[in-house]
């Protein structure tokens, strides 16, 4: 059998079975399921004198592992004293020790009920800046309890001096409050109130509930694509309104500029979705120079059924700039698909996240529908990255075996583009 460390259990009597005039009492410690021999059991009796006796180990029939009991007999003021049984098993490791601290006897007790309550949303249905969690520990036989708050299973450093205990009749209740920032609460972590009482653990957990449908009307305002801004030089921004209920009232989308200057004529499109909601988009051409110089554009959405207008604004992204690095690869031939190949393009370490990706063949830009490009993803400390994938046919690479992956980004120089060529059969 392989090495196995012991499980350790305290052995106590029921308090009501010990005569009130008893001058000495015996308690024990069971170490079981260990292999090989031996275990060393020592006792910490505090200020009291005690005598110990460790029984010879017995073999557990099914597993072949060992079990032993150590008994401690103490005299004196044992009722208020806590005792520690320390079990060491050097075959497991030289420093393997398990401590069990307990009193001479166990009382009958009513265990607590543990329940977490949380503070309400504000009047507008939003989370307040801080969220209070209240742990109610109720209906237990009075005695020492320990309350610990955990965040995703990790002990939190919480001031527990605010915990208050009340007694009603023969039972007690305690409450402990935890204050969280809105950000921590919205981070989707699980918060647990863990109560230790009479050697047992009781707990309750909570986390932010998932958003419930139906959602309200939402509005989004996009920035111009780098391709439209720097290559076509005809940038547009789009105001998108989703989850509208089709009704007689019209949705009004009005555009304005923070500078107060006039806006161009916008185009509008309405689409009924499969789920019965209406989507409205309004596209506004903007001046290239106006955008680059930092003009702010606003889209205002009004509708008879909306309690108030929705306002969205957009402007050039602030923050540091970093040009993209572009790497293009061709995948090797795959059995059974000799007439098709996949090209991949990794574009990374760019800031801000706005980027356009194009593929060219024979100096001609391929339609966007031909390639699939991920949304920009954040990296730790070095901007964003995207992957783009293009499937090409034998006819294409036999006509000209050079494909170009091009990134359009404001920090790229010269002329806001960086490109890399890739061949299906390099060197041929």
């Amino acid at each position: 059998a392989s090495t196995q460390s012991p499980s350790v259990f305290p052995l106590t009597r029921c308090c009501k079975n010990i005569p009130s005039n008893a001058t000495s009492v015996t308690l024990g410690c069971l170490a079981t399921g260990y292999f090989p021999e031996p275990v060393m059991v020592t006792w910490d009796t505090g200020s009291l004198n005690g005598t110990t006796m460790t029984l010879p180990a017995t073999t557990l029939t099914l597993s072949g592992h060992y079990a032993t009991i150590s008994l401690l007999t103490v005299s004196g003021a044992w009722a208020k004293q806590m005792f520690t049984c320390r079990v060491a098993h050097t075959p497991s490791s030289t420093d393997w020790v398990d401590n069990k601290t307990f009193s001479v006897c166990s009382r009958d007790f009513t265990p607590p009920t543990v329940k977490i309550l949380q503070s309400s949303c504000d009047g507008g249905g939003h989370f307040p800046p801080t969220i209070q969690l209240l742990c109610l520990v109720s209906g237990y036989t009075p005695g020492t309890i320990n309350i610990t708050w955990l965040e995703d299973g990790q002990v939190m450093d919480v001031d527990l001096s605010t915990a208050s205990t009340t007694q009603e009749g023969e039972l007690a209740s305690t409450q402990s409050e935890l204050t969280l920032s809105q950000k921590h609460w919205l981070s989707d972590r699980t918060y647990t109130c863990q109560v230790t009482y009479q050697g047992h653990t009781f707990e309750d957990s909570t986390k932010k509930c998932a958003d419930s449908n139906p959602r309200g009307v939402s509005a989004y305002l996009s920035r111009p694509s780098p391709f439209d801004l720097f290559i076509r030089k005809s940038p547009t921004i789009t105001c998108l309104v989703v989850d509208l209920a089709p009704s007689k009232g019209t949705v009004n989308l009005t555009w304005s500029r923070a500078s107060g200057k006039p806006v161009n004529h916008s185009t509008r499109k309405e689409e009924k979705q499969r789920n019965g909601t209406l989507t409205v988009t309004s596209t506004l051409p903007v001046g290239t120079r106006d955008w680059i110089e930092g003009e702010t554009y606003q889209c205002r959405v009004t509708h008879p059924h909306l309690p108030r207008a929705l306002m969205r604004s957009t402007t050039k992204t602030s923050g540091p700039r970093a040009a993209p690095e572009v790497y293009a690869f061709a995948t090797p031939e795959w059995p059974g698909s000799r007439d098709k190949r996949t090209l991949a393009c990794l574009i990374q370490n760019f800031m801000p996240e706005d980027i356009s990706v194009q593929w060219l063949h024979n100096e001609v830009q391929l339609p966007d529908a031909r390639h699939s490009t991920t949304q920009p993803r954040k990296t730790k400390g070095s901007g964003f990255f995207v992957f783009s994938r293009l499937e090409v046919t034998r006819a294409e690479w036999e006509q000209k075996d050079e494909f170009i992956c091009r990134a359009v980004h404001e920090a790229a120089s010269p002329s806001q583009t960086v490109q890399r060529a890739v061949s299906v059969n390099p060197g041929k």
């Epitope: 920032s181 950000k183 400390g381 070095s382």
Partner: nanobody, 122 residues
């Protein structure tokens, strides 16, 4: 709408001090970790320092450790960067930044201010 406005930049002699401020609005400032990021002319962006929501946990880039101190005043929605013993290589545009994620350390942030220029030269 998140707004961050930096101030306090300027021209300072090597060895001198400078204090940058960042006024935040449009979000619950005390619920967000905050950071400072800089970019020297012709160089890539560099994370400088971060501070957690309560102001107890701070992190610094090795290049500024012991010279720069980040702090915050949640009551007034303000973030600060006290820069001492400034060197010519500290010359850069400095931005205060924040993020929807936990962002104590180098990161690509969701929100930046407009930036403030710091020039260290004799």
């Amino acid at each position: 709408e998140v707004q961050l406005v930096e101030s306090g930049g300027g021209l300072v002699q090597p060895g001198g001090p400078l204090r940058l401020s960042c006024a935040a609005s449009g979000f619950t400032f005390g619920s967000y970790d905050m950071s400072w990021v800089r970019q020297a002319p012709g160089k890539g962006p560099e994370w400088v320092s971060s501070i957690d929501t309560g102001g107890d946990i701070t992190h610094y880039a090795d290049s500024v450790k012991g010279r720069f101190t980040i702090s915050r005043d949640n009551a007034n929605n303000m973030l600060y960067l006290q820069m001492n013993s400034l060197k010519p290589e500290d010359t850069a545009v400095y931005w205060c930044a924040t993020d929807e994620d936990y962002a104590l350390g180098p990161n690509e942030y969701d929100y930046y201010g407009q930036g403030t220029q710091v020039t260290v030269s004799s």
